[in-house]
């Protein structure tokens, strides 16, 4: 049975030519994660971390794309285009596949403002 | 320049273990995992499993977990991949490869390691 | 595991032709797929990453397309030196797995 909880940063804004901080947290059991995979809204990969064997950064964002923190992914110079969906895949065991979403809003404006508040979608 | 230079060929009898090593040199060992791949005589590729030489984390192909072991010596940049209850079907050649970094591709491998299996 | 499934198992074809074979993954590995020539005797060489990144030094005429489930490694025009096996390989989630090779030689 799967307890666990994915909780994420949720709704996010950040200012282009800026970076940001994607970020999942699973909580409420005990599974071991074996690899995060971090995808785009189209499901395009952006990097897997897989627990030993470390990170994979595709080279579609090799530049733009700084492993973690933790198990989070850092998206550097943003663009109008990084706007959109983000999506985490918790692989474990026992239980399985966790998935959590990041709607990530770039924007022109100098008053943007980054959240990084917790939620749980 | 980089270097994969794996231990010689070897005759096992059933039930035995072998121990294959793979010296390395040319690249920063800790930073990059080392993989263990095999193959059969005229046959496809098998991705035994990998190490982080770095951390002595492991990840096993599921087929051959409680059977193979893989350590590192960083003293001498040398990875090693063991079997154990040594099988026939285990007569094939065994490969290490490193992956390039931040990518899951293998862009050096060694000579190759021929294992025969036989009574 | 996830499989992949290589066609055709061998191909024969003329010197300077296309040369083109197909990978199969049986779920979505999304672009986690890269292709490994092997001549006998040598281990494999990589050729191609993340389904369409042609890897240092490798000659132009080695392209690869796809996503998802559906893969393709195309020699423009084909060179006795290109005389070898080939396999796609996914890395999307482990256990990593490789294609059962196609063997390709001079018509």
């Known amino acids: 049975m799967m307890t666990g909880t994915i909780e994420t940063t949720g709704n996010i804004s950040a200012k282009k030519g800026g970076s940001v901080i994607l970020q999942c947290h699973l909580s409420s059991t005990m599974a071991q994660v074996t690899q995060v995979n971090w995808e785009q809204h189209d499901h395009s990969l952006l990097a897997i971390r897989n627990a030993e064997l470390g990170w994979h950064i595709y080279p579609a964002f090799k530049d733009r794309v700084a492993p973690g923190p933790g198990l989070g992914l850092t998206l550097q110079s943003l663009t109008m285009n990084d706007t959109g969906e983000y999506f985490c895949t918790y692989h474990t065991y026992p239980d399985g596949t966790y998935r959590g979403r990041i709607f990530l809003e770039v924007l022109e404006s100098s008053v943007a403002e980054h959240s990084a508040r917790f939620q749980i979608p | 320049q980089v270097q994969l230079v794996q231990s010689g060929a070897e005759v096992k009898k059933p039930g035995a273990s072998v121990k294959v090593s793979c010296k390395t040199s040319g690249y920063a060992f800790t930073e990059y995992t080392m993989h263990w791949v095999r193959q059969a005589p005229g046959q496809g590729l098998e991705w035994m499993g990998g190490i982080n030489p770095n951390t002595g984390g492991t990840t096993y192909n599921q087929k051959f977990q409680g059977r193979v072991t893989l350590t590192v010596d960083k003293s001498s940049s040398t990875a090693y991949m063991e079997l154990s209850r040594l099988r026939s079907d285990d007569t094939v050649v065994y490969y290490c490869a490193k992956l390039l970094r931040l990518m899951y591709y293998f862009d050096y491998w060694g000579q190759g390691t021929l294992v025969t299996v036989s009574s | 595991d996830i499989v992949m499934t290589q066609s055709p198992d061998s191909l024969a074809v003329s010197l300077g032709e296309r040369a083109t074979i197909n990978c199969k993954a049986s779920q979505d590995v999304r672009t986690a797929v890269a292709w490994y020539q092997q001549k006998p005797g040598q281990p494999p060489k990589l050729l191609i990453y993340s389904a369409s990144y042609r890897y240092t030094g490798v000659p132009d005429r080695f392209s690869g397309s796809g996503s998802g489930t559906d893969f393709t490694l195309t020699i423009s025009s084909l060179q006795a030196e290109d005389v070898a096996v080939y396999y796609c390989?996914?890395?999307?989630?482990?256990?990593?797995?490789f294609g059962g090779g196609t063997k390709v030689e001079i018509k």
């Open positions: 390989h996914q890395h999307y989630i482990t256990p990593w797995t």
